[in-house]
């Protein structure tokens, strides 16, 4: 690889424990997204919070290893956690520059393959791009 | 194939800007940094910075911040860079590259008055 | 700034013969995601420069096999196992772990 992997950085207010420290943030002013280039890993990660029909970013960042998921081009969440009831965390693995900065589409929010109701989804060729 | 292609010599005045423009085709345009290198007469390279133009997020080296603006125009898959408050020791070659596989023909600006 | 000492300046080879090229880092290159990002560029007369070697050992599509790249953390070396008359040119080793990316002064590379 020619360079180091530069995935967003972006942390929700109140979320507990920080990535910060698994990078270096790169100075990119204050309209564009905050980008962080990976110390451990060449994986960036996002974490989105699904409720009810509205996803919210909470954790965008580096890894801190290169992990199965790593190897993927682009950031295909699946389901993780139950926080609170109606609502599901989605976690994605991603091995490219800034491919945690968007999905294509959220999976069912119950078990991985188990069936449920379609989380937001992006029309067919588009991408959702997360606001931070 | 890939290609780079950068605009042409520059003769500017000292204190004066310049613009120059590097027009890449035979990939996609947004999925690869884009760098630019300075080359300063009978010298070596030096690095002045990066960009992705997905998102416009830019890298730079400390030494060309507030001398190097980096800029992309997506729907023409050109990158631009806009040097400022040019002197006489900005005379020097500048080359583009794609995450210095490809490189451009590089842009000769010459800084007299 | 990481700075980059190649070494010698300047080489002189007989055709045919083979040719080595030093790169020392004033800090070891390897990251902490287990990549050294080392590369090497020529850069002939009247041209761009050209990439060879990527991360230390990968030759860039299109490099003939005379050349190779070998080393780790601070001591890099460029080989050309039998050197032609188009290998003429300015070697560059170039670090792009640490930022600033910096490049080596250059070896200027001629025919005997």
């Known amino acids: 690889p020619p360079n180091r992997r530069t995935c967003v950085f972006f942390e929700a207010p109140g979320v507990r424990g920080s990535t910060k420290t698994l990078g270096e943030l790169l100075d990119t002013g204050t309209e564009l997204p905050r980008a962080i280039r990976c110390l451990y890993s060449r994986c960036c990660f996002g974490i989105w919070n699904l409720t009810q029909d509205r996803a919210q970013v909470e954790m965008q960042g580096c890894r801190d290893s290169d992990e199965p998921g790593c190897e993927s081009l682009h950031c295909d969440p699946s389901p993780r956690a139950h926080p609170s009831p109606g609502s599901t965390l989605f976690t994605c693995s991603c091995g490219t520059d800034f491919c945690n900065a968007n999905y294509s589409h959220l999976p069912p929010p119950g078990s991985p393959g188990t069936p449920g109701s379609q989380g937001p989804q992006a029309a067919p060729g588009e991408s959702i791009w997360m606001a931070l | 194939q890939v290609q780079l292609v950068q605009s042409g010599a520059e003769v500017v005045k000292p204190g004066a800007s310049v613009k120059m423009s590097c027009k890449a085709s035979?990939?996609?345009?947004?999925?690869?940094?884009v760098s630019w290198v300075k080359q300063s007469p009978g010298q070596g390279l030096e690095w002045i910075g990066e960009?992705?133009?997905?998102?416009?997020?830019?890298n730079f080296n400390e030494k060309f911040k507030g001398k190097a603006t980096l800029t992309v125009d997506k729907s023409t898959s050109t990158a631009y860079m806009e040097l400022r408050r040019l002197r006489s020791d900005d005379t020097a070659v500048f080359y583009c590259?794609?995450?210095?596989?490809?490189w451009g023909q590089g842009v000769l600006v010459t800084v007299s008055s | 700034d990481v700075v980059m000492t190649q070494s010698p300046l300047s080489l002189p080879v007989t055709l045919g013969q083979p040719a080595s090229i030093s790169c020392r880092s004033s800090?070891?290159?390897?990251?902490?995601?287990?990549?050294?990002?080392l590369e090497w560029f020529q850069q002939r007369p009247g041209q761009s420069p050209r990439r060879l070697i990527y991360?230390?050992?990968n030759r860039f599509s299109g490099v003939p096999d005379r050349f190779s790249g070998s080393g780790s953390g601070t001591d890099f070396t460029l080989k050309i196992s039998r050197v032609e008359a188009e290998d003429v040119g300015v070697y560059y080793c170039?670090?792009?772990?640490?930022?600033?990316?910096?490049f080596g002064q250059g070896t200027k590379l001629e025919i005997k």
């Open positions: 960009i992705y133009p997905k998102n416009g997020v830019s």
């Open positions: 800090q070891s290159l390897e990251y902490g995601d287990g990549y050294t990002y």
């Open positions: 590259t794609r995450q210095r596989d490809y």
């Open positions: 170039f670090q792009a772990t640490h930022d600033p990316n910096t």
């Open positions: 991360g230390v050992s």
């Open positions: 035979g990939y996609t345009f947004t999925d690869y940094w």
